[in-house]
Amino acid sequence: IWELKKDVYVVELDWYPDAPGEMVVLTCDTPEEDGITWTLDQSSEVLGSGKTLTIQVKEFGDAGQYTCHKGGEVLSHSLLLLHKKEDGIWSTDILKDQKEPKNKTFLRCEAKNYSGRFTCWWLTTISTDLTFSVKSSRGSSDPQGVTCGAATLSAERVRGDNKEYEYSVECQEDSACPAAEESLPIEVMVDAVHKLKYENYTSSFFIRDIIKPDPPKNLQLKPLKNSRQVEVSWEYPDTWSTPHSYFSLTFCVQVQGKSKREKKDRVFTDKTSATVICRKNASISVRAQDRYYSSSWSEWASVPCS
């Protein structure tokens, strides 16, 4: 058993039929010695008396809020949560496996630049009685500070008869050095509590590996005289690291016809302009990627040829 926060404790249980469970001793936080009784949740049934209560925790029915009383007055509470281990593996019931980029990916994180600011998100089908707490650091043995905000519900999607909920959190490395080579990864730890179930999820990454620039901005077309060609121009996104001479992007320019089956013409360039043939009813799209490190491409910025 360990303390998650004040008066909230996590009991780690091997979860299998007829498992013996864990013996837990609760102590009433009071100077009183006599006349103390214990109850669980809203029940008025007295579970025991005395300053300590010894219980065998085997299942969710044994978890909950234990309260010690004296003469009708509440003295203190202890909330017991369960963390299930099945076949040696901690349960992952609360979050959905996003399966990207690989199986057992519960947390996904992205950064728009090298400032040390990043966003992580996760999915669940659970809509109520659910709390998240996020901690982060760079390195684990001698951790350097990363500050994370509160997790918030960022999207709700309908999947058949069920809804799926996306939560996200923003974190900022306290003393980020954008130009430095990373040697220790960022660690992100999410505590999830649904009713009386506790689970924890972790992700470890280098900022360079989770970079995904915003799409190029100010995408414009300039027709070239007496030609089917146009000059496409764009700018670095505002959120990208500066100076651009050091934090450079490379770009992919794509001409796509109205039909998805039509052949796509693609041009790769390090410049912020390119000349392409603009077909009728086609659209021109541009996306960006770090020039020197193959992390994710940005989403496309698009304009119609017409």
Partner: antibody
Framework: SVEESGGRLVTPGTPLTLTCAVS????????MIWVRQAPGEGLEWIGI?????NTYYASWVKGRFTISKTSTTVDLKMISPTTEDTATYFC??????????????WGPGTLVTVSS | FELTQTPSSVEAAVEGTVTIKCQAS??????LSWYQQKPGQPPKLLIY???KLAPGVPSRFSGSGSGTQFTLTIGDLECADAATYYC???????????FGGGTEVVVV
């Protein structure tokens, strides 16, 4: 205690509001649920309203009902009733432990008949 | 999400025992309650958290199970136990909520 009212005979498409009046406890501490039971059938949950006023509906509801509350009442509005909505409608109070809760205080029910 | 109750009807003698099963289509941990309903009356809570007896309910009623399989057992049957019994999942309103189809208990 909780008590439903407002059930009556209505023609299809006529909106109807059922009211659940509560006494002896505050709605700010409990989830409330509306459940219905067609004649000779089982219990079917319609939706709940949490202590903070958030509403959640069964997937089949699809905008056919809305739940709201005041300090002492919980309303179920039937937007455009059909004959399939003929049932006894129950209001019940949760235990107070959770939003998705079990229900330990039930009203006697109010009968809604939808017929032309 | 589905809660399947079996059997739909059961007949048993006074002082006998009845067992009703409730199966969830996904794990709901122990977030299951049982209700008794008599004709013309609202449901009455018997069991919550799969196995905890509601206040004032005789100990002849007991609940067990977790995950997807749950059981309500009524021992030492009395005529007053003739009713329809429903299980209810309250895991989450989106990811596992609702009532089973009901089991009618006839006491002979």
């Amino acid at each position: 205690s909780v008590e439903e009212s407002g059930g009556r005979l209505v023609t299809p498409g006529t909106p109807l509001t059922l009211t659940c009046a509560v006494s002896g406890f505050s709605l700010s501490g409990y989830t409330m649920i509306w459940v219905r039971q067609a004649p000779g059938e089982g219990l079917e949950w319609i939706g709940i309203i949490s202590s903070s006023g958030n509403t959640y509906y069964a997937s089949w509801v699809k905008g056919r009902f809305t739940i709201s509350k005041t300090s002492t009442t919980v309303d179920l509005k039937m937007i455009s009733p059909t004959t399939e909505d003929t049932a006894t409608y129950f209001c019940a109070r949760g235990s107070g432990a959770y939003i998705s809760d079990y229900f330990n205080v039930w009203g006697p029910g109010t009968l809604v008949t939808v017929s032309s | 999400f589905e809660l399947t109750q079996t059997p739909s009807s059961v007949e048993a003698a006074v002082e006998g025992t009845v067992t009703i099963k409730c199966q969830a289509s996904q794990s709901i941990d122990s977030w299951l309650s049982w209700y008794q309903q008599k004709p013309g009356q609202p449901p009455k809570l018997l069991i919550y958290s799969a196995s905890k007896l509601a206040p004032g309910v005789p100990s002849r009623f007991s609940g067990s199970g977790s995950g997807t399989q749950f059981t309500l057992t009524i021992g030492d049957l009395e005529c007053a136990d003739a009713a329809t019994y429903y299980c209810q999942s309250y895991y989450d309103v989106n990811a596992g909520y609702g009532f089973g189809g009901g089991t009618e208990v006839v006491v002979v």
